[in-house]
């Protein structure tokens, strides 16, 4: 057959769906690869063709759209499963073509089994709630387009294994779950199950997400440098190892880039000739406040190095701070017989 623009296997769109539930999968061509939509393509006489490769097979085969109860169907640029089966797992290809044009992309679809508590290999989206911030809501995700607005589904919310009922601060409100005041104890996996009728059958959509309670912007402060500080002096003799930790606390801030860096005599360590290494470690509190430690290390310090200015810098969306380390050369201890005796006026 003639040439076809092949976008390959789009692993960025690793689609996971639960077994025995409906799934609607849009052809990624129109969302990410082509500059026109399905309607435009259809009007121009282009045809969308679907096929697939089963798991652990190499053979591409057409999708069977003649299954009982139209279990698999296509509607515009959407491939529908009503419902999925475990062996639907594989790589799916959508191809747009006419006699003069062809473009195609493949994507992996994994049908996943869940247990009685909704645990599964599904990669879960994380929703962050601010601690003690007032009413916040999460919404049952990815259920648009499954049923018309005239259909009134029922929605049941679970935390882990348990239906959410009589919780002090968590209230199910249809597609939304309201947290009156989020606390650390609200961390966990939340599942909504949407049940709706269609053509005399009942379908269920299960959606699980992880809730993580994080520091509130109300409590956020600029970075705080705990070390270096004015109380600690790094006093070294030439030839010794100089180790200076820079320890910085960052309040949690949504989408903030936290940065820590050292300057030596106003330059980045990479831009100077001394043999310096910097090791970084990061730890997080329960509310995702962050503590970064960068340890500046000079294996064999020289008297020149001990005269330099070592400054720790930190930056977040809340501001930038800097603190110089107090570094000095250790005065050699006096040799008792000569220096001290002289000091006492001995001859």
């Amino acid at each position: 057959s003639e040439r076809c623009d092949d976008w390959g296997l789009d692993t960025m769109r690793q689609i996971q769906v639960f077994e025995d539930e409906p799934a609607r999968i849009k052809c990624p061509l129109f969302e990410h690869f082509l500059k026109f939509n399905y309607s435009t393509a259809h009007s121009a006489g282009l045809t969308l063709i679907w096929y697939w490769t089963r798991q652990d097979r190499d053979l591409e085969e057409p999708i069977n759209f003649r299954l009982p109860e139209n279990r698999i169907s296509k509607e515009k640029d959407v491939l529908w499963f009503r419902p999925t089966l475990l062996n639907d797992t594989g790589n799916y290809t959508c191809m747009l073509r006419n006699t003069t044009y062809c473009s195609k992309v493949a994507f992996p679809l994994e049908v996943v089994q869940k247990d009685s508590c909704f645990n599964s290999p599904m990669k879960l989206p994380v929703h962050k709630l601010y601690i003690e911030y007032g009413i916040q809501r999460i919404t049952c995700p990815n259920v648009d387009g499954y049923f018309p607005s005239s259909v009134k589904p029922t929605i049941t919310w679970y935390m882990g294994c348990y239906k959410i009922q009589n919780f002090n601060n968590v209230i199910p409100e249809g597609m939304n779950l309201s947290f009156l005041i989020a606390l650390i104890s609200n961390n966990g996996n939340y599942t909504c199950v949407v049940t709706y009728p269609e053509n005399g059958r009942t379908f269920h959509l299960t959606r699980t997400l992880t809730v993580k309670v994080v520091g509130s912007p109300k409590n956020a402060v600029p970075p705080v440098i705990h070390s270096p500080n004015d109380h600690v002096v790094y006093e070294k003799e030439p030839g010794e190892e100089l180790l200076i930790p820079c320890t910085v606390y960052f309040s949690f801030l949504m989408d903030s880039r936290n940065e820590v860096w050292w300057t030596i005599d106003g330059k980045k360590p990479d831009d100077i000739t001394i043999d310096v290494t910097i090791n970084e470690s990061i730890s997080h509190s329960r509310t995702e406040d962050e503590t970064r430690t960068q340890i500046l290390s000079i294996k064999k310090v020289t008297s020149e190095d001990l005269k330099r200015s070592y400054v720790c810098h930190a930056r977040s969306a809340k501001g930038e701070v800097a603190k110089a380390a107090k570094v000095k050369q250790k005065v050699p201890a006096p040799r008792y017989t000569v220096e001290l005796a002289c000091g006492f006026g001995a001859t």
């Epitope: 025995d20 089966l85 475990l86 089994q113 869940k114 009685s116 049941t156 009922q165 009589n166 049940t195």
Partner: antibody
Framework: QVQLVQSGAEVKKPGSSVKVSCKAS????????MNWVRQAPGKGLEWMGR????????HYAQKFQGRVTITADKSTSTAYMELSSLRSEDTAVYYC??????????WGQGTLVTVSS | DIQMTQSPSSLSASVGDRVTITCSAS??????LNWYQQKPGKAPKLLIH???GLHAGVPSRFSGSGSGTDYTLTISSLQPEDVATYYC?????????FGGGTKVEIK
């Protein structure tokens, strides 16, 4: 379409056990709960317990705890309910009922178990 | 266990009548209530789940409402094929429990 086909009627002696089967088709057996409910002649419905065949999780009503065992065979999509130490008041129609969540969406046709000496 | 009390235990109404059956729980059940229909000699069938959600294929003359401890099943226009016993069932807290049933007959 969902179908639950139960085993045939049984007559049992007091003190013995009965094992009722429920063969499922038309849905993914491992993705739904299978409940067991009984109904004594002319009486109401009584929930006994349930199993999630996907992971074998079971829940039983306290009343039947220790006397009822619910199992599932994934290879044949069949659920079983075994009731031991039978007495005359266990005479009832026993139903299996499938539910993706907690409501029992579809039911078997029922199995009459008669306990008589 | 949660006790479910249904009333009336039986009723007789004419074709086309509006029929109401009530179900009361011994404690709040947060709308986790189902209604089942059982015709003589047959297995029960799910009519309504989660207080008001019509099960697939159930005629729209059936509707459910309620909250807290008190729930209602309404048949807006009784039909001959609605002759059956109706049961409520709570699924708020294990073990699931049923009401005693309401037998509906045609006058």
């Amino acid at each position: 379409q969902v179908q639950l086909v139960q085993s045939g009627a049984e007559v049992k002696k007091p003190g013995s056990s009965v094992k009722v089967s429920c063969k499922a088709s038309g849905y993914t057996f491992t993705s739904s709960w299978m409940n067991w409910v009984r109904q004594a002649p002319g009486k109401g419905l009584e929930w006994m317990g349930r199993i999630y065949p996907g992971d074998g999780q079971t829940h039983y009503a306290q009343k039947f705890q220790g006397r009822v065992t619910i199992t599932a065979d994934k290879s044949t999509s069949t659920a079983y309910m075994e009731l031991s130490s039978l007495r005359s008041e266990d005479t009832a129609v026993y139903y299996c009922g499938e539910g993706y969540l907690d409501p029992m969406d579809y039911w078997g046709q029922g199995t009459l178990v008669t306990v008589s000496s | 266990d949660i006790q479910m009390t249904q009333s009336p235990s039986s009723l007789s109404a004419s074709v086309g009548d509006r029929v109401t059956i009530t179900c009361s729980a011994s404690q709040g059940i947060n709308n986790y209530l189902n209604w089942y229909q059982q015709k003589p000699g047959k297995a029960p069938k799910l009519l309504i789940h989660y207080t008001s959600g019509l099960h697939a294929g159930v005629p729209s003359r059936f509707s459910g409402s309620g909250s807290g401890t008190d729930y209602t099943l309404t048949i807006s226009s009784l039909q001959p094929e609605d002759v059956a016993t109706y049961y409520c069932q709570q699924y708020s807290i294990l073990p699931w429990t049923f009401g005693g049933g309401t037998k509906v007959e045609i006058k």
